[in-house]
């Protein structure tokens, strides 16, 4: 594979986060080559001596893949020719967190870039009116979070108000003994107001809004990954 080790190509990565138990993407792009057979992609992880993934001559080459990634990785083979070296990681584990290197060799030269990959659990909260409660109460539930998040309530009418005295948050460990279900209850809510339940850890921030009027209830949820451009 005759490349002069002196030429460098541009490789770009994006920090991202993976949701435990789901599939994740480690993003990497590079200056494309005209021949697929001239492109080599190697993914490495700090502290792991075997390869995370290797793609060469148009196909996966997994003979040197480290055990911890066996059967869990794939590149987007049809997109390699246009410079996409992103790695799909199946069934993300907590231990997949760390620094990865995307290393590319083409006929033009070689290049690499590192990316930080965080792992945890995050999910959309759903806010509902708790009709079983003795007073007007809102219940905010999110099924999977890790690490343990903070929960803060806010209201459109009482902006800047501190609801910690009139709310109660609990965390219930899920069956796989890693992630937790988040339940937060807000008491003494008033009608014709919009309340927000904000759940946040160092990986993600999620908000569940509920607008309660005499005639209707409107809900909206939003989730944003932190420290990530993905």
């Amino acid at each position: 594979f005759g490349i002069s080790g002196r030429h460098s190509i541009t490789v770009t990565t994006v920090a991202s986060a993976g949701n435990i138990g789901e599939d994740g993407i480690l993003s990497c792009t590079f200056e494309p080559d005209i021949k697929l057979s001239d492109i080599v992609i190697q993914w490495l992880k700090e502290g792991v001596l075997g390869l995370v993934h290797e793609f060469k001559e148009g196909k996966d080459e997994l003979s040197e893949q480290d055990e911890m990634f066996r059967g869990r990785t794939a590149v987007f083979a049809d997109q390699v020719i246009v410079g996409n070296a992103s790695l799909r990681l199946k069934n993300v584990q907590l231990t997949d967190a760390g620094t990865y290197k995307c290393y590319i060799i083409t006929s033009k030269g070689k290049g690499n870039a590192n990316l930080e990959y965080k792992t945890g659990a995050f999910s959309m909260p759903e806010v509902n009116v708790d009709y079983n409660a003795s007073s007007e109460t809102l219940r905010c539930e999110a099924p999977r979070w890790f690490p343990q998040p903070t929960v803060v309530w806010a209201s459109q009418v009482d902006q800047g108000a501190n609801f910690s005295e009139v709310s109660n948050t609990s965390f219930e460990l899920n069956s796989e003994n890693v992630t937790m279900k988040v339940v937060s209850v807000l008491y003494n809510v008033t009608i014709n107001n919009t309340y927000s339940c904000m759940i946040e850890n160092d990986i993600a921030k999620a908000t569940g809004d509920i607008k309660v009027t005499e005639s209707e209830i409107k809900r909206r949820s939003h989730l944003q990954l932190l420290n990530s451009k993905a």
Epitope: G5, L44, E64
Partner: antibody
Framework: EVQLLESGGGLVQPGGSLRLSCAAS????????MHWVRQAPGKGLEWVSA????????YYADSVKGRFTISRDISKNTLYLQMNSLRAEDTAVYYC??????????????WGQGTTVTVSS | DIQMTQSPSSLSASVGDRVTITCRAS??????LAWYQQKPGKAPKLLIY???NLPTGVPSRFSGSGSGTDFTLTISSLQPEDFATYYC?????????FGGGTKVEIK
């Protein structure tokens, strides 16, 4: 100063056991993968075993697999090689070495002075 | 396992000579190659990593080249302290392997 210091070598009978130690100092031990490399008298270098920085992954040459066990104690900054069922062909100077680079793709940049293992009846 | 074949196994040279040692891998190892120098009774010393890079403190008369399967260690002007045995080593595979060594002797 970055340093590796091996100990534990000696004379042992065939079938016997030895435990080699390698005390590390001057660097953050748990961020570097470590190797054991041996050199039989008058011969070249032979890789024996490796362990990842966390200790979670271990690797062995076919010639020692099932007989040798590599481990590390991060609290003591020490690397170990437990050698069982020793054979005459295990006679060598054993070196511990630190892996350069965060991703395992580079060479071994720091070596100990070596400890001699002699297997003979 | 990946076989690493060094040539020559020994050579005689004089101070000031340009010396070239080659190493061939049995399969593509890209640039996952290191070179070491070893003197009698001493531990090996890293000379080159990633096929072409010199660690801090290694004199610039040492250089490495190559990628894929064919690699070269060059000493541009041999010095008295360079008489030693030189080894190549691959780290592409997690069954690390060394070449058989090249002994550089005084002519």
């Amino acid at each position: 100063e970055v340093q590796l210091l091996e100990s534990g070598g000696g004379l042992v009978q065939p079938g016997g056991s030895l435990r080699l130690s390698c005390a590390a100092s001057g660097f953050t031990f748990n961020t570097h993968a470590m190797h054991w490399v041996r050199q039989a008298p008058g011969k070249g270098l032979e890789w024996v075993s490796a362990i990842s920085g966390s200790g979670g992954s271990t690797y062995y040459a076919d010639s020692v697999k099932g007989r040798f066990t590599i481990s590390r104690d991060i609290s003591k900054n020490t690397l170990y090689l437990q050698m069982n069922s020793l054979r005459a062909e295990d006679t060598a100077v054993y070196y511990c070495a630190r892996l350069l680079g965060r991703f395992g793709e580079y060479g071994m940049d720091v070596w100990g002075q070596g400890t001699t293992v002699t297997v003979s009846s | 396992d990946i076989q690493m074949t060094q040539s020559p196994s020994s050579l005689s040279a004089s101070v000031g000579d340009r010396v070239t040692i080659t190493c061939r891998a049995s399969q593509n190892i890209y640039t996952w190659l290191a070179w070491y120098q070893q003197k009698p009774g001493k531990a090996p010393k890293l000379l080159i990593y990633d096929a072409t890079n010199l660690p801090t403190g290694v004199p610039s008369r040492f250089s490495g080249s190559g990628s894929g399967t064919d690699f070269t260690l060059t000493i541009s002007s041999l010095q008295p302290e360079d008489f030693a045995t030189y080894y190549c080593q691959q780290s592409y595979s997690t069954r690390w392997t060394f070449g058989g060594g090249t002994k550089v002797e005084i002519k």
